[in-house]
């Protein structure tokens, strides 16, 4: 985790005047001026009543304000004389001392209160040196750190109990630990005091750093008893238009000319082709003039434009139908969703003075008129001997975004003689067990002189067709079966060829014994 912070509540090292702590009895601890390792003047306390047994010398610090701290650490620097190096002393010589504390809501202690004993004082630990020294040695300084808590009152006193040691208390520092404010996972966590116990984990709520957004919640970090952060929960990440910087402690705006479309830890990217940004922190780059993005295009796709016109439109006219074919546009606008539309215009009048208008709805386009993927269309049901203009438009996914109409290539054609239109309804004139006599009206648009009619018929149960021709607009079908149903269709023929068959019509022969229906007098010649 991050390095712990230590805040001092009291440190004798920086006191140059008298400490004036309270000692009991007065013959015990004695305040002495001395020097530390760096030869700085310091105030120390010494005790060395080793020649007398049953020592109980207490020393109490001044009142130390707690500052909402729950656990206090005490760093003690001291030297202890080796009992073995002191001649002629009783067996009561000690090389340890005891550390106590006493909590109070104000500086209430006096020379006699609280009583100089464990309870009311709370024992922290018995402090033993790592090294003691003999008379011949220079004093070896021991450093010990102990902690205590939880604390609840306004402040406390430290107390030291000597029970027969020869020692010097060189410095006392009371301090507490806290976790330093930190940034982790693009979130900011405030300076946080450690808990009451060494094992305590104190939750610190986090907030996203500027230009970051939460990706998982709650945002928290745990401050352990050593003032170190651990177990991050939740995270933030850089918002759109911002990228990580300074080891995940900043989210920096994308500089002009770059963008970032999605939140996350990715970097800003240069604008895709045909797009730009004019300000920092862009989440999308805007398209250059005449370039667009389709609704389905992502922010990281290039801006594209409309296709150029199709090339090389070829028409192949056959009577009142034609096939149009063309080649791909030279410029697809940077897209692969090219489609074609075919616009049909019927022209009236001669030469340059002709006016053209949209074609009738009955004109048929195969496979379709709009949204063609193939570069070929079959157009039928045009009028004979009529001039038409066909515009083949090239469109793509951004054509709808452009204020201009689609680019197109045009071709002018004139239709030829057409085959006759469909024969309208057939009428039954008479039927017998073996024949049907039928008639029909000529086509609405014969488109020329009708040469003859062809009739296709089959028995519905069998389904095998036969054909007969007739010069008239009537016919008698012979060789049929009685009580049978027949489907009949007729088509007309001119020099331009056969027209469409009429819609299937159904007729039934009578039973063998049944009499034929009455014959119509009228048989219309062609």
């Amino acid at each position: 985790g991050c390095r712990a912070l230590e805040e001092t509540l009291m440190d004798t090292k920086w006191v140059t005047s008298e400490l004036a702590w309270t000692s009991h009895p007065e013959s015990g601890w004695e305040e002495v001026s001395g020097y530390d390792e760096a030869m700085n003047p310091i105030r120390t306390y010494q005790v060395c009543n080793v020649r007398e047994s049953s020592q109980n010398n207490w020393l109490r610090t001044g009142f130390i304000w707690r500052r909402d701290v729950q656990r206090v650490y005490v760093e003690l620097k001291f030297t202890v004389r080796d009992c073995n190096s002191i001649p002629n002393i009783p067996g009561s010589c000690k090389e340890t001392f005891n550390l106590f504390y006493y909590e109070a809501d104000s500086d209430v202690a006096s020379a006699s209160s609280p009583f100089w004993m464990e309870n009311p004082y709370v024992k922290v630990d018995t402090i033993a040196p790592d090294e003691s020294f003999s008379r011949l040695d220079a004093g070896r300084v021991n450093t010990k750190v102990r902690s205590f808590g939880p604390l609840s009152k306004a402040g406390f006193y430290l107390a030291f109990q000597d029970q027969g040691a020869c020692m010097s208390l060189i410095s006392v520092r009371a301090f507490y630990k806290k976790c330093a404010s930190t940034t982790a996972g693009f979130a900011l966590f405030p300076e946080t005091l450690t808990g009451a116990e060494p094992t305590s984990l104190v939750i610190a709520p986090g907030t996203c750093i500027p230009n970051a957004v939460e990706v998982s919640v709650p945002l928290k970090l745990y401050c352990n008893g050593d003032g170190e952060w651990m177990v991050p929960v939740g995270a933030c990440t850089c918002a759109t238009g911002h990228e990580p910087a300074a080891k995940e402690s900043q989210c920096r705006p994308c500089p002009p000319g770059s963008y970032k479309a999605k939140q996350g830890e990715g970097p800003c990217l240069p604008c895709p082709p045909n797009s730009r940004t004019t300000s920092p922190a862009a989440s999308i780059c805007t398209c250059h003039n005449n370039f667009y993005r389709a609704d389905s295009d992502s922010a990281d796709s290039a801006c594209t434009t409309v296709p150029s016109p199709p090339r090389g439109v070829i028409s192949n006219v056959n009577e009142t139908s034609l096939i149009l074919e063309w080649s791909e546009p030279r410029d697809l606008g940077g897209r692969d969703d090219l489609l074609y539309n075919v616009i049909c215009k019927k022209c009236h009048g001669a030469g340059g003075a002709s006016a053209c208008s949209r074609c009738d709805d009955n004109v048929e386009f195969v496979p379709r008129q709009l949204g063609l993927t193939e570069r070929r269309v079959h157009i039928s049901h045009l009028l004979a001997h009529t001039r038409y203009t066909f515009e083949v438009q090239a469109v793509n996914g951004v054509s709808g975004k452009s204020p201009l109409p689609p680019r197109y290539a045009a071709v002018n054609i004139t239709t030829n003689q057409a085959a006759p239109s469909e024969v309208p309804t057939l009428r039954l004139h008479s039927s017998s067990g073996s024949s049907l006599t039928l008639s029909w009206a000529p086509p609405e648009r014969p488109n020329g002189v009708i040469l003859d009619y062809e009739m296709k018929y089959f028995e519905k149960s069998e389904g095998i067709a036969s054909t007969v021709t007739s010069q008239m607009n009537s016919v008698q079908l012979d060789g049929l079966r009685p009580d049978a149903r027949y489907v009949v269709q007729v088509r007309a023929r001119t020099v331009a060829g056969y027209g469409q068959y009429s819609r299937p019509a159904e007729f039934e022969t009578t039973s063998e014994r049944g009499s034929g229906a009455q014959q119509l007098q009228e048989q219309l010649p062609l």
Partner: antibody
Framework: EVQLQQSGAELVMPGASVKLSCKAS????????IHWVKQRPGQGLEWIGE????????NYNQKFKGKATLTVDKSSSTAYMQLSSLTSEDSAVYYC??????WGQGTTLTVSS | DIVMTQAAFSNPVTLGTSASISCRSS???????????LYWYLQKPGQSLQLLIY???NLASGVPDRFSGSGSGTAFTLRISRVEAEDVGVYYC?????????FGGGTKLEIK
């Protein structure tokens, strides 16, 4: 292209009924009768009956009257044959045909407990 | 009902030679309109039936002209002029003169 798509194989209990289907495409459904034919291994082919899809007029083989019922649904260009009171004798392949020219692929019916 | 009779097996034929399959009806299939309502079908192994000949002697659409049909009112013949391996199967005759329409028992074409 004329196509007659028949329903998949059926395994049914004796005494039950079953409805076989025949979906027509590629032609004017109402212009041709639909015939139904039964084929049992080693028993040859038997004509069951025919139906006119335009008005549901039917002709049945006397042998299959009460056994087979022919119907059509013009909206979906589908012909149906319902077989009732099934016995092991009804286990066979059943074909539908357009007129007598185009045949479906057949539906295998197995009647077994 | 009109009974249609066929031999169960043909005489074994060699590929490239001609084969004939016969069919008899218990009643004349010649209608007063001059049409003989006799039809020939082939059922290849694992397949449905395919129309070969209609009205005794007319070749159905898409059928090779190696196949031909002939006969009188009650005796009918299907002829294959040059038998090919793909012609293997069961050949059925059917009458469509009167209800109920009936089929022959089928003749299996045997290759030597």
């Amino acid at each position: 292209e004329v196509q007659l798509q028949q329903s998949g194989a059926e395994l049914v209990m004796p005494g039950a009924s079953v409805k076989l289907s025949c979906k027509a495409s590629g032609y004017t459904f109402t212009s041709y009768y639909i015939h139904w034919v039964k084929q049992r291994p080693g028993q040859g082919l038997e004509w069951i009956g025919e139906i006119d899809p335009s008005d549901s007029y039917t002709n049945y083989n006397q042998k299959f009257k009460g056994k087979a019922t022919l119907t059509v649904d013009k909206s979906s260009s589908t012909a149906y044959m319902q077989l009732s009171s099934l016995t092991s004798e009804d286990s066979a392949v059943y074909y539908c045909t357009r007129g007598i020219t185009n045949w479906g692929q057949g539906t295998t019916l197995t009647v077994s407990s | 009902d009109i009974v249609m009779t066929q031999a169960a097996f043909s005489n074994p034929v060699t590929l490239g030679t001609s084969a004939s399959i016969s069919c008899r009806s218990s009643k004349s299939l010649l209608h007063s309109n001059g049409i003989t309502y006799l039809y020939w079908y082939l059922q290849k192994p694992g397949q449905s039936l395919q129309l070969l000949i209609y009205r005794m002697s007319n070749l159905a659409s898409g059928v090779p002209d190696r196949f031909s049909g002939s006969g009188s009112g009650t005796a009918f013949t299907l002829r294959i002029s040059r038998v090919e391996a793909e012609d293997v199967g069961v050949y059925y005759c059917m009458q469509h003169l009167e209800y109920p329409f009936t089929f022959g028992g089928g003749t299996k074409l045997e290759i030597k």
